[in-house]
Interface confidence: medium
Amino acid sequence: MVLEVSDHQVLNDAEVAALLENFSSSYDYGENESDSCCTSPPCPQDFSLNFDRAFLPALYSLLFLLGLLGNGAVAAVLLSRRTALSSTDTFLLHLAVADTLLVLTLPLWAVDAAVQWVFGSGLCKVAGALFNINFYAGALLLACISFDRYLNIVHATQLYRRGPPARVTLTCLAVWGLCLLFALPDFIFLSAHHDERLNATHCQYNFPQVGRTALRVLQLVAGFLLPLLVMAYCYAHILAVLLVSRGQRRLRAMRLVVVVVVAFALCWTPYHLVVLVDILMDLGALARNCGRESRVDVAKSVTSGLGYMHCCLNPLLYAFVGVKFRERMWMLLLRLGCPNQRGLQRQPSSSRRDSSWSETSEASYSGL
């Protein structure tokens, strides 16, 4: 972002909007950093902070419990399988892990919203990084699932099924590696920062405005637009192929993955639209004023809550859309409840074949 502020010019509100920075006051600025003066004062945050204080702790606590139970159940069902996991199931296991790790950070953010950040800078970095790693991982793994389905159905290329199992693991490792890379700014720039106005400490970024905007653009593109485009492209082609082949069983088998992707889009689109408004305000394309800033802050809290809800939604979707997941869950619960009962050998007819409960390859189209 290039700031065109000429000499001998008094800065007004429209011009200072782009000059907001986030360094701590003790930072010794390098000459190449933004050199300007003086910004419009930060807006009063009373309304948005009070809203966060009331809304976020309750929501985060609920999502924490639901996410932990739901994703724990998904992981348990997948890991209880005696045979090797299919490619989609492996991705879904990693997705459950990502969602679980994300919801594990929610109690910390609940405390941050309710009172202040009391966990120190170290945990601030870890929690922030963990949160973002799993935000990105969730989106990228869904894109991987859709790409796997696309190759499998449209090109009849079972990239992971016929190849060595290491291939899907390598893909997952690449996703986690990429997410770690995306989370580097969290490790570097997040810290517990004391806010003089609020007389409270919060886990915040301490870097220049241009970095904040860049990170938001990265989040928007890598964590939402790109995965969504991949999913949309892949599933559009898959549906086209399945409709042409008039394979009703195939279409039924597609339900779960399509519903999962639609859920991702519905849950995260509102948040990213708000982030887009924030980016436009950062860049000066939209005038920043205190009223708008307050509305954006509240909208961000509500829509991010909706986004985090996605972490708890996948297990519910599997439970209600995926027949096999329900059966396996039930069997697992029975096995946990009465491990020595012979009755467990009587399996429901639809799940006698030990095929994946999410797989949509020819081997298991009847599975969902």
Epitope: E31, S36, S40
Partner: antibody, heavy 123, light 106 residues
């Protein structure tokens, strides 16, 4: 301890010029935006000029724009105000003041002030 | 330009009194800043961000307000509080100050 010491004030004729200096110590001068604020005898405070920490940006109110120039020498930890085409209404005590940084934003209020130097414009 | 008008301009009060100084802005400001100045001395930052007391300012001082009207309150006047108080805004440039309120001993 933060210290700001102004010098260079005195009696000058209308239309004349004067250069004020402000020696800063006790803080990292290069990290802060600086300003000049004046106070006419028995009157209130009036902001005169501001310069960014690196000296790239300068800001003035309409009352002095084109006549006054703020500058700084970061190597010497010194702030300057070059005043040209002085008028009787420029008579005042001129204070050098520091802008605090809050959350990385250079704030438009002043946390430290010098003791001031008197500039009298009179024939 | 945003004009700041302080009232009253002069205020006579006794030690122990509760005193309130008002600063009205010609258009809404986000925060207000207060300075204390004693005769022959430089101003001192007294209150920033409307209600945060600067370092070393006694707790008997408080600031409040929003939008167009802000107040500085001294709960119990002490001899050292007699001075001139100025309000300042920087919501929009140029930075402007109020004309000052001189607090005198009755």
């Amino acid at each position: 301890e933060v210290q700001l010491l102004e010098s260079g004030g005195g009696l000058v004729q209308p239309g004349g010029s004067l250069r004020l200096s402000c020696a800063a110590s006790g803080f990292t001068f290069t990290s802060y935006a600086m300003s000049w604020v004046r106070q006419a005898p028995g009157k209130g405070l009036e902001w005169v000029a501001t310069i960014s920490r690196g000296g790239t940006y300068t800001y003035y109110p309409d009352s002095v724009k084109g006549r006054f120039t703020i500058s700084r020498d970061n190597a010497k930890n010194t702030l300057y105000l070059q005043m040209n085409s002085l008028r009787a209404e420029d008579t005042a005590v001129y204070y050098c003041a520091r802008h605090p940084i809050y959350s990385g934003q250079y704030q438009g209020y002043f946390d430290y002030w010098g003791q001031g130097t008197l500039v009298t414009v009179s024939s | 330009d945003i004009q700041l008008t302080q009232s009253p301009s002069f205020l006579s009060a006794s030690v122990g009194d509760r005193v309130t100084i008002t600063c009205r802005a010609s258009s809404g400001v986000n925060y207000l800043y207060w300075y204390q100045q004693k005769p022959g001395k430089a101003p001192k930052l007294w209150i920033y961000f409307t209600s945060t007391l600067a370092s070393g300012v006694p707790s008997r001082f408080s600031g409040s307000g929003s939008g167009n009207e802000y107040t500085l309150t001294i709960s119990s006047l002490q001899p050292e509080d007699f001075a001139t108080y100025y309000c300042q805004q920087f919501t929009s440039s140029p930075y402007t100050f109020g004309q000052g309120t001189k607090l005198e001993i009755k």
